[in-house]
Interface confidence: low
């Protein structure tokens, strides 16, 4: 069979599984005269043999872990032993079998983790090696937690990244670990090769002892600070502490105050920087943040509460320069004249704002002093000694002292003595007839004027008329304003009229005085009037129950999931048909009858959230009027975007030859949502074979450093694969490539002879 197992001398490559006893020849080389024999040289390791007639074979099992490629040379010799053909390269690639078990680098690992550490953030790595080929399942390792001791309520507090061996807290671990309850845990970790997927996989176990340390990054107790402090500022009021030294502290004012009177130093001590005024602001809530040297937050912010304690720094104030009350002639002793209500800006319901009232002077003192008294705490003025006569004294002036525990203020009250209220208001008409209005008549429209008269003393509370609707308008759609000079009442629309709920309203008005009627006089039918309001129908569009409907779903919901619903009603009671408008991404459909909204395509938060569409409600039948509302779909993030490089890194180079190991910094990102703390990526080399030449080390949650391990690099391009894990739930991993060129440099730039190649690197390291 010429060609497959035999043929002329030429460069060839053969693949042979390791660990197999020889069962057949590798190849039969055919000699061309004057060649008569063959010779084998190179990395034979006394395994590979060629017979003089050209038969190439091996005499015992290969071991890939000893040598993965055997570079041989075969030459054809003439009868005198002179090479007449070749030597040509013959490459034997040794294919891997799973003949090595994974082995942990340590039989016991020790680590510590702080309580409340972020779930998914690695605090310890276990590492196993397997001599088999990492490019095949034989060398692909799979880590698992076998046992967690102790196990409380069957809850796992720890998790392991199956691929990287990174141990981190679960969400429950982050919330529940407490060194006061349980300061240490033990994990048994297993590692399997074959990616953990085969019953024939080899495995190893290791023990991990974990100490739980206290998290001192805790919100301090709320602080109370007395206002108007005269002590020298700044004054330390509280403190926060990060778990390790070197944190950079700052305060965040979420309220965006024009004056933020707090500061923090690099020890974590928090100060008030100036005196506070409770009457300006009685409490502050702000946040303390700890960041690393790169400005990345180390943990969640802490909420700081400061309550400002009141001191009595405000005197009472009068409601107006002069407060005017009226009292009728012949009013009885003890009758209330009115209440003086003074104010105090100090804290309510405390001694600092508790007021006392006292009459300090009455003028004139006719027919005697002490005609009035004031309730000490309520401020209510009463007639104290006798009824008053207008013709004797038509007006009294009182000076009233209002005091809190430290301050006194004088307020002035004028009391006008007025005619007795012995006349009732009388309507000029008892029936104002019918009025027909369309239901869409504007709010604020005056629809009727009514008039009553009162024969008591003009421009006093005895003759002033107040109109009330006492029947026929339980919805409060109408109101009556009174002209104080003429006592004319203007009936005004205050709320929209509605044919559907009140087509006919039988309205009853009552006219009354602010002053009480004298004993024995009562309001009668003359003080009442009626009128009938007839509302005509206007076909109205449907009305949505909300201007904006909002729903929240996870971006990975299954197609066909109900994501929300809208409701509208037609005032005339017609059926409604719902539709969507502006569904530019084609994500949603609406049930025309029920208003339920469903997903019809995969949703994607990264494409934009909230997703805004309009919903339209249209009358079925009638004049098909419609109205529009908004539907906002808030998409909650799931970890569905693997990390990637933050920018294009083509053009990285080192000048060849390297005089010392070099390094470069690169940045990763992903499109998922990263709340306050930002992403927390972990970085590793993409394959085991890179570890001899390169090293990758994390700088912070987004940046890492790629360093050379030695200086012996060839003058060519190397493609370094980097594995970036986002530590999310589930963790996603991206493998990115950083092309790094080693090239001869001229004045710090890569030198290439003209026409050598395109895409010359442009960034030197």
């Amino acid at each position: 069979q010429e060609g497959k197992f035999s043929g002329p001398l030429k460069p060839m490559t053969f693949s042979i599984y390791e660990g197999q006893e020889p069962s057949q020849i590798i190849f039969q080389f055919k000699a061309n005269p004057p060649a008569v024999t063959f010779e084998l040289t190179g990395e034979t390791d006394n395994i590979f043999v060629i017979e003089r007639e050209g038969l190439l074979y091996y005499n015992r099992a290969l071991d890939r872990e000893t040598r993965s490629t055997h570079n041989l040379q075969v030459a054809a010799l003439d009868a005198n032993g002179i090479i007449v053909e070749g030597p040509v390269p013959i490459t034997i690639k040794v294919k891997d079998i799973n003949d090595n078990r994974p082995t942990f680098l340590q039989s016991k690992y020790e680590g510590s983790v702080r309580q409340n550490s972020r779930p998914g953030k690695p605090f310890l790595y276990v590492n196993a090696t397997d001599l088999d080929d990492p490019a095949t399942p034989n060398g692909q390792l799979y880590y698992q937690i076998v046992i967690q001791l102790p196990m409380i309520n069957n809850v796992m507090y720890f998790q392991i990244n199956n691929k990287t061996g990174a141990i981190s807290l679960t969400r429950e671990g982050s919330q529940e670990l407490n060194p006061a309850k349980n300061p240490s845990y033990n994990l048994v970790i297993s590692v399997k090769d074959m990616g953990g997927q085969s019953e024939n996989s080899f495995s190893d176990t290791t023990s991990v002892d974990i100490i739980v340390t206290e998290n001192i990054w805790k919100a301090p107790k709320p602080v109370e600070m007395v206002e108007n402090s005269t002590d020298p500022h700044p004054i330390k009021i509280t403190q926060v502490r990060w778990n390790d030294p070197g944190a950079q502290y700052s305060l965040v004012d979420k309220e965006k105050l024009p004056r933020f009177p707090f500061s923090i130093d690099q020890e974590g001590d928090i100060y008030v920087t100036q005196p506070l005024d409770r009457e300006e602001k009685d409490a502050y809530v702000f946040y303390a943040v700890a960041k690393d040297e790169y400005g990345k937050p180390l943990s969640y912010p802490l909420e700081i509460h400061v309550k400002v304690k009141d001191i009595n720094d405000n005197p009472p104030t009068c409601p107006s320069p002069v407060t005017v009350f009226e009292v009728q002639e012949n009013e009885r002793l003890g009758n209330s004249i009115g209440t003086l209500t003074a104010h105090d800006r100090d804290e309510e319901n405390t001694a600092n704002s508790f007021l006392n009232y006292r009459i300090v002077e009455q003028t004139p003192k006719l027919p005697m002093d002490g005609l009035f008294l004031i309730q000490t705490y309520a401020g209510m003025l009463q007639l104290a000694k006798q009824s008053l006569k207008k013709q004797d004294t038509p007006q009294y002036n009182l000076t009233i002292e209002v005091s809190d525990k430290d301050f006194k203020t004088l307020c002035f009250v004028q009391i006008n003595v007025i005619d007795i209220n012995d006349q009732i208001p009388i309507f000029e008409k008892s029936d104002y007839g019918n009025l027909t209005l369309a239901e869409d008549t504007n709010i604020g429209s005056t629809i009727l004027t009514i008039q009553a008269t009162d024969a008591d003393e003009p421009f006093t509370g005895s003759s002033k008329i107040l109109y009330h609707i006492i029947k026929g308008d339980s919805e409060g759609r109408l109101g009556v304003d009174t002209d104080p000079h003429t006592n004319t009442g203007y009936v005004i629309i205050k709320k929209p009229l509605d044919f559907e709920t009140a087509a006919v309203s039988n309205i009853v008005f009552k006219a009354e005085n602010p002053e009480p009627l004298v004993f024995g006089v009562k309001y009668n039918a003359s003080s009442f009037a009626k009128f009938t309001l007839i509302v005509t129908d206007v076909n109205e569009a449907p009305q949505f129950s909300q201007h904006v409907f909002q729903a929240k779903v996870s971006e990975d919901v299954a197609i066909g999931t109900k994501v929300g619903n809208v409701t509208a009603k037609d005032p005339e009671g017609l059926d409604i048909s719902y539709s969507l408008r502006g569904d530019t991404r084609g994500w949603l459909k609406i049930d025309h009858v029920t208003g339920e909204i469903f997903s019809v395509a995969p949703l994607d938060r990264e494409a934009g959230s909230p997703y805004r569409v309009q919903v339209v409600a249209t009358e079925v039948g009638g004049s098909s009027l419609s109205s529009v509302s908004e539907f906002h779909l808030i998409l909650m993030d799931v970890n569905d975007n693997p990390p990637r490089l933050a920018k294009d890194y083509t053009g990285l180079f080192f000048c060849h030859p390297l005089s010392a190991p070099g390094s470069l910094i690169f940045e990763a990102t992903d499109d998922d949502q990263h709340l306050f703390r930002g992403p927390h990526f972990t970085f590793s080399l993409g394959s085991g074979s890179l570890q001899n030449d390169w090293e990758v080390s994390k700088i912070n949650g987004t940046h890492a450093r790629l360093s050379t391990r030695h200086t012996e690099f060839e003058e060519r391009e190397y493609v370094v694969l980097i594995r970036i894990n986002d530590g999310g739930r589930p963790p996603l991993e991206g493998i990115v490539s950083l092309p790094v060129t080693f090239c001869s440099c001229v004045e710090g730039s890569c030198f290439r002879p003209a026409g050598h190649q395109t895409g010359i690197p442009t960034v030197g390291m």
Epitope: Q144, I145, V146, I147, Q148, L149, P150, M151, N154, M156, V188, S190, S203, T205
Partner: nanobody, 114 residues
């Protein structure tokens, strides 16, 4: 003292079913991964099925779709439901807790034969 007691083995015809049980005592059962191994005469011991504390299951290719492993933490018992049994399933079945370096029972004989 830790004890694992298997039961439920026996003679069954090809295509038949058996349910093996393994009752554990003397340890905190819920903290351990559980598994079933088998060993046929003259053959190496073989992992049949494993169930971790997280609920992850692993099955030998030869039993996938036929055998189901489950556990009842309240009863400290692990089960192996074996359906569509074949002659090549004949072996002594051992229950195991905590992986290869953990605890193993005495075994129960399963014979599939017509």
């Amino acid at each position: 003292e830790v004890q694992l007691v298997e039961s439920g083995g026996g003679l069954v015809q090809p295509g038949g079913s058996l349910r093996l049980s393994c009752a554990a005592s003397g340890l905190r059962f819920s903290s351990y991964a559980v598994g079933w191994y088998r060993q046929a005469p003259g053959k190496q011991r073989e992992l049949v099925a494993q169930l971790t504390i997280n609920g992850d299951t692993t099955y030998a290719d030869s039993v996938k779709g036929r055998f189901t492993i489950s556990r009842d933490n309240a009863k400290a018992t692990v089960y192996l439901q074996m359906n569509s049994l074949r002659p090549e399933d004949t072996a002594v079945y051992y229950c195991n807790l905590g992986g290869s370096k953990g605890y193993r029972g005495q075994g129960t004989q399963v014979t599939v034969s017509s």
